[in-house]
């Protein structure tokens, strides 16, 4: 019965998941959602680096209202969109000491969501109905991911922020039936 999609004023459908992968331990320990940490120190040579952390990509912000049928959020939400190709941090067009745009010749680096956050929205509905409380999943930061032809499908699904979405109208099932299955379901990250 929960929502399966949110719609903005441009009628773009933004699917929503009830369950997301847990962040790797290093993300949980070393990053907060407030920091969009893309890239690190510049590589010694822009074409030879093998460390994905040394690549960066652009984060674009846009604002939209969340709607569901006749109901619309009282305030807009600001979303982060991971955009563009990845290149060494020091060669990005918006970096200090602008260099030319770097085009990878070997493996492809894609700009994908790194961390997620939740934002509660207050939905105002016509007819004097009480406002509804909903959480939307928003991207908090972006990262570069190396993609080669050897990547299998399970790794590729990392690219779509909603790659493993449940069927419409169906509640997501727990991913694992281990002793920690329920914990995983409650503890998963935004």
């Amino acid at each position: 019965q929960g929502w399966q999609a949110f719609k903005n004023d441009a009628t773009e459908i933004i699917p929503e998941l009830g369950e997301y992968p847990e962040p790797p331990p290093e993300l949980e320990n070393n990053k907060t959602m407030n920091r969009a940490e893309n890239g690190g120190r510049p590589p010694h040579h822009p074409f030879e680096t093998k460390d994905v952390s040394e690549y960066s990509c652009r984060e674009l912000h846009f604002t939209r209202y969340v709607t569901d049928g006749p109901c619309r959020s009282a305030k807009p939400v600001t979303e982060l969109v991971c955009s563009g190709q990845c290149g060494p941090a020091r060669l990005l067009p918006n970096a200090i000491g602008r260099g030319k745009w770097w085009r990878p010749s070997g493996p492809d680096f894609r700009c994908i969501p790194d961390r997620y956050r939740a934002q509660r929205v207050q939905l105002l509905c016509p007819g004097g109905e009480a406002p509804r409380a909903r959480k939307v999943r928003l991207v908090a930061s972006c990262k570069c991911k190396r993609l080669t032809r050897f990547h299998n499908q399970s790794e590729l699904k990392d690219f779509g922020t909603e790659a493993a979405r449940p069927q419409k109208g169906r509640k997501p099932r727990p991913r694992a039936r281990s002793a920690k299955a329920n914990q995983a379901e409650l503890e998963n990250a935004y």
Epitope: Q1, G2, W3, E16, L17, G18, E19, Y20, E28, T32, M33, N34, R117, A118, Q119, R120, Q122, E129, A130, P131, R132, A133, K135, V136, R137, A140, K171, P172, E185, L186, E187, N188, A189, Y190
Partner: antibody, heavy 121, light 108 residues
Framework: EVQLVQSGAEVKKPGASVKVSCKAS????????MNWVRQAPGQRLEWMGD????????TYNHKFKGRVTITRDTSASTAYMELSSLRSEDTAVYYC??????????????WGQGTTVTVSS | DIQLTQSPSFLSASVGDRVTITCRAS???????LNWYQQKPGKAPKLLIY???NLASGVPSRFSGSGSGTEFTLTISSLQPEDFATYYC?????????FGGGTKVEIK
């Protein structure tokens, strides 16, 4: 291990204010909403409001008519609830409660131990 | 505000009994936003079931939840000594979030 540790019991006079703290540990503080719920003696639980520590976004129960203010200090992983213009009926146990990260529910999966606030002249 | 009415408000039962608690809402509540908590005297509430029917971490399988719309139920299939407590339903479909009045389960 996730833990929410609240400040100690308070005794206040009518008209005063009280500020209760809730220190979070064992998880990334900015990743989860924090709710405040109170329970007067022998009464049902009553939701007061919540805060998104990521961006300081707050929502309050209109019942408290501007008397409640929820804040946070991300550097200390601590949430605060301040209730002003206290009256005797505000005597209650006040709980902070972390909201689960599951996007399609607003359930509260971890609770503080509670802070007893007594309002008496 | 959405009113949640629990019945019965008091329940006397024996170990091994099957117990059912009902939560009725004044308006239809989306099942994803209906939760159940257990509270023992002097303790904080503990999440039992979220989204109507999902068991929270560490909660025994003898607890189950069901329902939709305006009527939801919590069932304990075989009451255990540690289950004697007060149970609350909660909705956070509509602002503000509200709780039921509680059902106290005592030993017969």
């Amino acid at each position: 291990e996730v833990q929410l540790v609240q400040s100690g019991a308070e005794v206040k006079k009518p008209g005063a204010s009280v500020k209760v703290s809730c220190k979070a540990s064992g998880y990334t503080f900015t990743d989860y909403y924090m709710n405040w719920v109170r329970q007067a003696p022998g009464q049902r639980l009553e939701w007061m409001g919540d805060i998104n520590p990521y961006n300081d976004d707050t929502t309050y129960n209109h019942k408290f008519k501007g008397r409640v203010t929820i804040t946070r200090d991300t550097s200390a992983s601590t949430a605060y609830m301040e209730l002003s213009s206290l009256r005797s009926e505000d005597t209650a146990v006040y709980y902070c409660a972390r909201e689960t990260a599951v996007i399609t529910t607003n359930a509260m999966d971890y609770w503080g131990q509670g802070t007893t606030v007594t309002v008496s002249s | 505000d959405i009113q949640l009415t629990q019945s019965p408000s008091f329940l006397s039962a024996s170990v091994g009994d099957r117990v059912t608690i009902t939560c009725r809402a004044s308006s239809s509540v989306t099942s994803s936003y209906l939760n159940w908590y257990q509270q023992k005297p002097g303790k904080a509430p503990k999440l039992l079931i979220y989204s109507t029917s999902n068991l929270a971490s560490g909660v025994p399988s003898r607890f189950s939840g069901s329902g939709s719309g305006t009527e939801f139920t919590l069932t304990i299939s075989s009451l255990q000594p540690e289950d004697f407590a007060t149970y609350y339903c909660q909705q956070y479909d509509f602002f503000p979030s509200t709780f039921g009045g509680g059902t106290k389960v005592e030993i017969k």
